[in-house]
């Protein structure tokens, strides 16, 4: 997944944000638990503004928003990434 | 390995539109997070984004230039097209086709292709 | 739309010298900056990314750093290859932007 000439980390988020994401901007996440040389859970997302970002794991809005995602019978499995993909 | 090549008119006059071409290869258009751009760089002068398209051919512009930019793509033959209307003397510059890729750790324009040098000149 | 303001938009330094190029952004954009640098005659490359990332095979006498909406790239210690211009990129949102750049000699 990382860019050849990135590849310098074993984590991929150098650092992470906590503020809140909108659902609505939210194109894609990935949840990925520790392991493959980065001892911390890692979660990407992708928004339809064409950036991908890192966000706290422990984030409230965060655990509420995988609920829901969840709930909607998107699974968030490591390296699967949850797809939201907006309505052409 | 990835490359990009940019080709135009080397001169084009005032008011004409200039079409530039992106050929690439290393990397496709198809896959979700790839995109293509230009950017463009008067001599001696800075950089200047314009504009870029990705996969889903979701494009975004310079609002600066928006009127006069169309961006686009042809995934199949890897390449992407820039054309810009009505163009005059500040137009000219090295025009430069750039890669990105939304992966992370997310580094927009990442690759880079050598530049074609434009020339608006009456 | 967010302004870069460079500075300086040149310098010139002695090979071993310390030097530090600026750039100030007009409004927030975190960690959504690169440094590129770019020789003579050739494309720009990406040389730090998230302000503070080092690209591979970027040698370590350069460094970033991020103090508010301040932004720094500072060389260790300067060496002949180093010769080139510097330009800062803010990819936190479209448009994206860039410095005016600094164009860093040989004194």
């Known amino acids: 997944i990382l860019e050849a000439h990135y590849t310098n980390l074993k984590c991929r988020c150098s650092g992470v944000i906590s503020t809140v994401v909108g659902l609505n901007i939210i194109d894609r996440i990935q949840v990925t638990p520790p392991g493959n040389g980065c001892p911390k859970t890692e979660v990407v997302i992708w928004t339809k503004m064409k950036k991908v970002i890192c966000v706290n794991p422990r984030a409230k809005w965060l655990q509420r928003l995988l609920r829901h995602v969840q709930s909607k019978s998107l699974s968030s499995t490591p390296q699967a990434p949850v797809s939201k993909r907006r309505a052409a | 390995q990835v490359t990009l090549k940019e080709s135009g008119p080397e001169i084009l006059q005032p008011s004409q539109t200039l079409s530039l071409t992106c050929t690439f290869s290393?990397?496709?258009?198809?896959?979700?997070?790839?995109?293509v751009g230009w950017i463009r760089q008067p001599s001696g002068k800075g950089l200047e984004w314009l504009a870029n398209i990705w996969w889903d051919d979701d494009k975004y512009y310079n609002p600066s230039l928006i009127n006069r930019l169309t961006i686009s793509k042809d995934t199949s033959n890897n390449q992407a097209f820039l054309k810009i209307t009505n163009v005059d003397t500040t137009d000219s510059a090295t025009y430069y086709c750039?890669?990105?890729?939304?992966?992370?750790?997310?580094?927009?324009?990442?690759?880079w292709g050598q530049g074609v040098m434009v020339t608006v000149s009456s | 739309d967010i302004q870069m303001t460079q500075s300086p938009s040149s310098m010139s330094a002695s090979l071993g010298d310390r030097v530090t190029i600026t750039c100030q952004a007009s409004?927030?954009?975190?960690?959504?900056l690169i440094w590129f640098q770019q020789k003579p005659g050739k494309s720009p490359r990406p040389l730090i990314y998230?302000?503070?990332n080092l690209a591979n095979g970027v040698p370590s006498r350069f460094s970033g750093r991020r103090s508010e909406s301040n932004y720094s790239l500072t060389i260790s210690s300067l060496e002949s290859e180093d010769m080139a211009d510097y330009h800062c990129l803010q990819f936190k949102q479209y448009p994206y932007t860039f410095g005016a750049g600094t164009k860093l000699e040989l004194k």
């Open positions: 750039v890669r990105s890729e939304l992966v992370m750790p997310y580094v927009p324009f990442d690759y």
């Open positions: 290393g990397f496709s258009l198809s896959p979700y997070g790839m995109g």
């Open positions: 409004q927030d954009i975190g960690n959504d």
């Open positions: 998230y302000a503070t």
